[in-house]
């Protein structure tokens, strides 16, 4: 069946060194356990995280995300998943695309991450 993919419509903010969660859902909601779910970064489609055949596919990940991501699947039965990125870096700032693929049908949603320096506001001296 067809569905839409929905992500946050406003930029998500995170501090360097913190962790951040990027939520994504399908509408209408349905069990996505058997779907392929992933995040990549445009414009070069570098894989941030991939879930396929009921497992995380670490081997497909871009090196800069290896060991830093986790797919939170507690609501995957409702078609809701969240990508957690640990130890956020300035290079993580920018666009991310989340996609759900069910057999040959795929939809995606774009979202934006803003990364801030936790110390930028401290006045010198």
């Amino acid at each position: 069946g067809q569905f839409r993919v929905i992500g946050p419509r406003h930029p998500i903010r995170a501090l360097v060194g913190d962790e951040v969660e990027l939520p994504c859902r399908i509408s209408p909601g349905k069990n996505a356990t058997g779907m392929e779910v992933g995040w990549y970064r445009p414009p070069f489609s570098r894989v941030v995280h991939l879930y396929r055949n009921g497992k995380d596919q670490d081997g497909d990940q871009a090196p800069e995300y290896r060991g830093r991501t986790e797919l939170l699947k507690d609501a995957i039965g409702e078609g809701k998943v969240t990508l957690r990125i640990r130890n956020v870096r300035f290079s993580d700032e920018g666009g991310f695309t989340c996609f759900f693929r069910d057999h040959s049908y795929q939809e995606e949603a774009a979202m934006e991450l803003k990364v801030e320096d936790p110390f930028y506001w401290v006045s010198p001296g």
């Epitope: 839409r4 929905i6 946050p8 419509r9 406003h10 969660e21 939520p23 859902r25 509408s27 209408p28 939170l72 507690d74 609501a75 809701k80 969240t82």
Partner: antibody, heavy 120, light 107 residues
């Protein structure tokens, strides 16, 4: 299964404050945005404000700005709504409601409601 | 704030009737609209979200349609359990607003 359990009914005097709690269970509290919605007797639903517990930042409806404070305690998965300078028009049922993650989503789970009566 | 206007305010219908409730937004809200059902003394219950998606566990006789500023909730064949008040709500902006409600009562 997500459940939101609210504190019990309150009777308050005009000019006083009330603090209502909303304890969440099931799911992950960090994946909630919690809003407070009230309903005066025989009236419709009115959004008062909400909070994203992982950030701790609250957002309020203009009508309640300065009179309402919404907080969340991640350690106990509980959200609170405090309304000050109570008047008789604040007599209502107060509901907490969950949005999944961000305030970009519908209210998919609701608390049972807390009746607040303001009377001298 | 975005104003949501529901019509009618009250609707008298019989079991088996097809019922339609309309909701208009004061500006475009894309598809960011939900419908709730509320019974006396109970919390609202989510029926439809994203304008047309049926919430899990909600009977298929409920359907939603529309986008932009005009939306409808349809109950294809009214059942005794459906007599209640229905609210639309926009979540286009982080100051969600509700319609004033439509009470569906027994004719």
């Amino acid at each position: 299964q997500v459940q939101l359990v609210q504190s019990g009914a309150e009777v308050k005097k005009p000019g006083s404050s009330v603090k209502v709690s909303c304890k969440a269970s099931g799911g992950t509290f960090s994946s909630y945005a919690i809003s407070w919605v009230r309903q005066a007797p025989g009236q419709g639903l009115e959004w008062m404000g909400g909070i994203i517990p992982i950030f701790g930042t609250a957002n309020y409806a203009q009508k309640f700005q300065g009179r309402v404070t919404i907080t969340a305690d991640k350690s106990t998965s509980t959200a609170y709504m405090e309304l000050s300078s109570l008047r008789s028009e604040d007599t209502a049922v107060y509901y907490c409601a969950r949005e999944w993650y961000w305030p970009d989503n519908p209210f998919d789970y609701w608390g049972q409601g807390t009746t607040v009566t303001v009377s001298s | 704030d975005i104003q949501m206007t529901q019509s009618p305010s009250t609707l008298s219908a019989s079991v088996g009737d097809r019922v339609t409730i309309t909701c208009r937004a004061s500006q475009s809200i894309s598809s960011w609209l939900a419908w709730y059902q509320q019974k006396p003394g109970k919390a609202p219950k989510l029926l439809i979200y994203d304008a047309s998606s049926l919430e899990s566990g909600v009977p298929s006789r409920f359907s939603g349609s529309g986008s932009g500023t005009e939306f409808t909730l349809t109950i294809s064949s009214l059942q005794p359990d459906d007599f209640a008040t229905y609210y639309c709500q926009q979540y286009h902006e982080y100051s969600p607003t509700f319609g004033q409600g439509t009470k569906v009562e027994i004719k």
